[in-house]
Interface confidence: low
């Protein structure tokens, strides 16, 4: 294989937004290999060496009035500007989740099982998934994959409930998400094999 | 207080491969990247291009600067090379699997550096190229990389799939397997 040594340079310009664009923090960061060497932080107001490797750059950039002024203005000229350009298709993007409930194994009643609530294809990632048994929230015995980013501007998550289903029981998966005004619910009845959407 | 949103302009330049990347990230998703060979902006979702524009030439200029700066830093560091960090690989589907219902296999390659990987989809052990797609290298908060590869497929009980990943941090190619997990049939006596 190719065993030549590799050398990597990674600049990152980060804009962190709090409460819309009310508070903005700009970071201009430079990484050699995996190590940050120098950065500008708008909360600091000047370039700082993170490692000795970045000291010449910090000193040089701080000595250049134009570079420093440009960096100090970036919260507005760069961050707030880009937020405004992209807001409609990023910040405001909403995609409704698809909710499906199924048992992980097809087991007879009164056998230990795992009920799966699959929530997929949603955006943004903030979501609340709850399990109810006969209208009462189940807080114990819940296992989750956590939030999974699909890389295509959608998320998915699986929230499992460890249970021993009994005849007549109604299990409900409830999903709250910014794309919907009221929670989405899907029921699974211990008698039936299929989940029906409400 | 945790921020609501983060936008990152992430770039890299890698020697001696002379590979570079310029992309914008919003909360961990790619908004666009610039195709260095075609010198054009590639929007992650086609509709994004209807709302905004980005002059690709600016990214090319940045990459030229990145290349020069990498040479400076390489020398300044007394030619200290990067340490290979091997990827973690996960294969999952886009949505719950139903037989003969179109779905997408996702190969998620995570926590690796440098940003060079060779990824191959295998169906029943043979390479598949039809319909496959991939993302560029995506930044992580720890300054390692992530990458997604996709394979649209029709789930069946006959086919098995593997995502095969090669990286300098791995001693041998890493294969992550996926196959249809058919639920065992209900005993007839159930009720």
């Amino acid at each position: 294989g190719d065993t030549r040594p590799r050398f990597l340079w990674q600049p990152k310009r980060e804009c962190h937004f709090f409460n819309g664009t009310e508070r903005v923090r700009f970071l201009d960061r430079y990484f050699y290999n995996q190590e940050e060497s120098v950065r500008f932080d708008s909360d600091v107001g000047e370039f700082r060496a993170v490692t000795e490797l970045g000291r010449p750059d910090a000193e040089y950039w701080n000595s250049q009035k134009d570079i420093l002024e440009q960096a100090r203005a970036a919260v507005d000229t760069y961050c707030r500007h880009n937020y405004g350009v992209g807001e409609s298709f990023t910040v405001q993007r909403r995609v409704q989740p698809k909710v499906t409930v199924y048992p992980s194994k097809t087991q007879p009643l009164q056998h230990h099982n795992l009920l799966v609530c699959s929530v997929s294809g949603f955006y943004p990632g903030s979501i609340e998934v709850r399990w109810f048994l006969n209208g009462q929230e189940e807080k114990a015995g819940m296992v989750s994959t956590g939030l999974i980013q699909n890389g295509d501007w959608t998320f998915q998550t699986l929230v499992m409930l460890e249970t021993v289903p009994r005849s007549g029981e109604v299990y409900t998966c409830q999903v709250e998400h910014p794309s919907v005004t009221s929670p989405l619910t899907v029921e699974w009845r211990a008698r039936s094999e299929s989940a029906q959407s409400k | 207080i945790k921020e609501e949103h983060v936008i990152i302009q992430a770039e890299f330049y890698l020697n001696p491969d002379q590979s570079g990347e310029f992309m914008f990230d919003f909360d961990g998703d790619e908004i666009f990247h610039v195709d260095m060979a075609k010198k054009e902006t590639v929007w992650r979702l086609e509709e994004f291009g209807r709302f905004a524009s980005f002059e690709a030439q600016g990214a090319l200029a940045n990459i030229a600067v990145d290349k020069a700066n990498l040479e400076i830093m390489t020398k300044r560091s007394n030619y200290t090379p990067i340490t290979n960090v091997p990827p973690e690989v996960t294969v999952l589907t886009n949505s719950p699997v139903e037989l003969r219902e179109p779905n997408v296999l996702i190969c998620f390659i995570d926590k690796f550096t440098p940003p060079v990987v060779n990824v191959t989809w295998l169906r029943n052990g043979k390479p598949v190229t039809t319909g496959v797609s991939e993302t560029v290298f995506l930044p992580r908060e720890d300054h390692l990389f992530r990458k997604f590869h996709y394979l649209p497929f029709l789930p069946s009980t006959e086919d098995v799939y593997d995502c095969r990943v090669e990286h300098w941090g791995l001693d041998e190619p890493l294969l992550k397997h996926w196959e249809f997990d058919a639920p065992s049939p209900l005993p007839e006596t159930t009720e």
């Epitope: - | 290349k67 020069a68 040479e71 400076i72 020398k75 300044r76």
Partner: antibody, heavy 120, light 109 residues
């Protein structure tokens, strides 16, 4: 403040060796990233880069003049010396030394230049 | 060796805008920063623009630099008589600094 000054003979004969000294102040050639270079300019012509020495004693030379040039530094004296062998009348020029504040950086401060005439 | 190509001369009337081009290749301008120097008659060159488009302190904002691919340009707006000088572009090619042939700017009138 940063200052550089070139010194050396104003007149050299063909085939002789030219030795030029650049004495500088206001910065140190031991600072990471810093370099000192030599550039010349024949009368009425363009600037031509000759050589550069950087903080860790790496030396870079113009391809076309490489065999004739030697650059060295004395960090304690704040001096950089350029020697050029086998001088020819076409080497008649104003010779400048200049500082580069970072590796592969621009020349941000220049000396006033010294005119060297090559004639028998 | 002159590796970067500049027009030998440009001219403009006071108050006008002029541009000076500098053409190179992938291995120099295409891969590295571009610097511009101003040389007034009988003096040493002075740094005007570095890192493609950055102005050192004290350089008026009438001077601006840009780079696109393997070419760069220097723009001077609101031309003044004291801008009459020679202008040189400079970049880097592998381990070598490279200069342009210089452009003489004449301010008319």
């Amino acid at each position: 403040q940063v200052q550089l000054k070139e010194s050396g003979p104003a007149l050299v004969k063909p085939t002789q060796t030219l030795t030029l000294t650049c004495t500088f102040s206001g910065f140190s050639l031991s600072t990471s990233g810093v370099g000192v270079g030599w550039i010349r300019q024949p009368p009425g012509k363009a600037l031509e880069w000759l050589a550069l020495i950087d903080w860790d004693d790496d030396k870079y030379y113009s391809t076309s003049l490489k065999t004739r040039l030697t650059i060295s530094k004395d960090t304690s004296k704040n001096q950089v010396v350029l020697t050029m062998t086998n001088m020819d009348p076409v080497d008649t020029a104003t010779y400048y030394c200049a500082r580069s504040p970072r590796y592969r950086g621009a020349f941000d401060y220049w000396g006033q230049g010294t005119l060297v005439t090559v004639s028998s | 060796d002159i590796v970067l190509t500049q027009p030998p001369s440009v001219s403009g009337a006071p108050g006008q805008r002029v541009t000076i081009s500098c053409s190179g290749s992938e291995s120099n301008i295409g891969a590295n920063y571009v610097t511009w120097y101003q040389q007034l008659p009988g003096t040493a060159p002075k740094l005007l623009i570095y890192d493609n488009n950055q102005r050192p302190s004290g350089v008026p904002d009438r001077f601006s630099g840009s780079k696109s691919g393997t070419s760069a340009s220097l723009a001077i707006t609101g031309l003044q008589s004291e801008d009459e000088a020679d202008y040189y572009c400079q970049s880097y090619d592998y381990d070598h600094y490279v200069f342009g042939g210089g452009t003489k700017l004449t301010v008319l009138g």
